[in-house]
């Protein structure tokens, strides 16, 4: 069974107890008392059911990573010490760890280190000190999710704001505006049209249109609304039909333009 010609080489695994916060690296050191010609160094974790996982190994000057690449073995320059590190430790990495050195044939022998315990604690937000440390970084997936949700919300809010602005502003802009001096006075048509007219422009207020602004609709010619413009203090003459853009330039209406109706 045991090989008498090979000394039982003590194997150390330190620290015996290690506590790290989640997300930090946890590093044990496995040390051989001597360096045999041919050996394998395994890194194990004991599970609660007394079963084990081999996390990683070192054999014949090369690292054999396990299934989880977070577990890394590094040989130090002195040749007999090995760093066994868990990158970005998780809460469920807590447990019992050890290393095992196997001397290879012709004198096969297994040597196990003492056990060491790792405790991974939840990351706590510490109160700010003299130089406050940055908050813990979220994990990649969570960070992406937060950014994505925030982007969508901002986009929706901007869209709602744009819709509200357009709904509030655009109907007036498309319909145009004018003032009417007296809605009670009917338009008088007579043969004696005055050669010069003065127009007072302002906002035409329709009480019956007071309701929630509707989203802007494209202006089609058949949807044009008309208002009667009364020219106060002068005998009325045939008015002029104009488009919203023609309201920009104040020109007197000419008799051939038809009835005194202005589009809104």
């Amino acid at each position: 069974l045991d090989s008498p010609d090979r000394p039982w080489s003590p194997l150390t695994f330190s620290p015996a107890q290690l506590t790290v916060q989640e997300g930090e690296n946890a590093t044990f050191t496995c040390s051989l008392a001597d360096i045999p010609d041919s050996f394998v160094l395994n890194w194990y974790r004991l599970s609660p059911r007394n079963q084990t996982d081999k996390l990683a190994a070192f054999q014949e000057d090369r690292i054999e990573p396990g299934r989880d690449r977070r577990f890394r073995v590094t040989r130090l320059p002195n040749g007999r010490d090995f760093h066994m590190s868990i990158v970005a430790a998780r809460l469920n990495d807590s447990g019992i760890y050890l290393c095992g050195a196997i001397y290879l044939p012709p004198n096969t022998q297994i040597n196990e280190s003492p056990r060491a315990e790792l405790s991974v604690t939840e990351r706590t937000l510490e109160p700010p000190t003299q130089s406050p440390s940055p908050p813990p970084r979220l994990s990649g997936q969570l960070q992406g999710l937060v950014i994505g949700v925030t982007s969508v919300l901002v986009g929706v809010l901007l869209l709602l704001l744009l819709t509200w602005v357009l709904a509030a502003v655009f109907p007036r802009a498309t319909r145009g505006a004018c003032v009417c001096g007296s809605e009670d006075e009917p338009l008088k048509e007579g043969p004696d049209a005055a050669p010069v007219f003065t127009l007072d422009y302002g906002e035409l207020d329709f009480q019956w249109r007071e309701k929630t602004p509707e989203p802007p609709a494209p202006c089609a010619p058949e949807q044009t609304e008309y208002a009667t413009i009364v020219f106060p203090g002068r005998p009325a003459s045939p008015g002029r039909r104009a488009s919203a853009s023609s309201l920009q330039g104040a020109q007197p209406p000419s008799p051939e333009d038809g009835p005194g109706l202005w589009p809104l």
């Epitope: 004991l46 196997i102 096969t108």
Partner: nanobody, 127 residues
């Protein structure tokens, strides 16, 4: 001092059953895959079953598949081999051995990954 000790062998008639045990001491039993080997008179030693430490998965040689079942109890540092429907060709000395791997990834061939052997237990199948 690492020791392995087999037990449960004996004389049995064809079609009969036996249950072998392999008790380990001096090592963390749960760290290592365990293999059952056998050696019939005048023949080479052959691997017949391996059971992983990590998940208890097993592999079997074709000659025993469907008749033999390996199991382990890490809390008791013991491995078992339930042998059913035995026939005279199963007559051999049965050995248990520790592997220095946790899994049976290397098959059943006799290999230098076997670290320790037990002394063996004799199984004889005859009418």
């Amino acid at each position: 001092q690492v020791t392995l000790r087999e037990s449960g062998g004996g004389l049995v008639q064809p079609g009969g059953s036996l249950r072998l045990s392999c008790a380990a001491s001096g090592l963390t039993f749960g760290l290592y895959a365990m293999t059952w080997f056998r050696q019939a008179p005048g023949k080479d030693r052959e691997g017949i079953s391996c059971i992983s430490s990590s998940d208890g998965s097993t592999i079997y040689a074709d000659s025993v598949k469907g008749r033999f079942t390996a199991s382990r109890d890490n809390a008791k540092d013991t491995m078992y081999l339930q042998m059913n429907n035995l026939n005279p060709e199963d007559t051999a000395v049965y050995y248990c051995a520790t592997d220095y791997e946790t899994r049976c990834d290397y098959g059943l061939r006799l290999r230098d990954r076997t670290a320790y052997w037990g002394p063996g237990t004799q199984v004889t199948v005859k009418p």
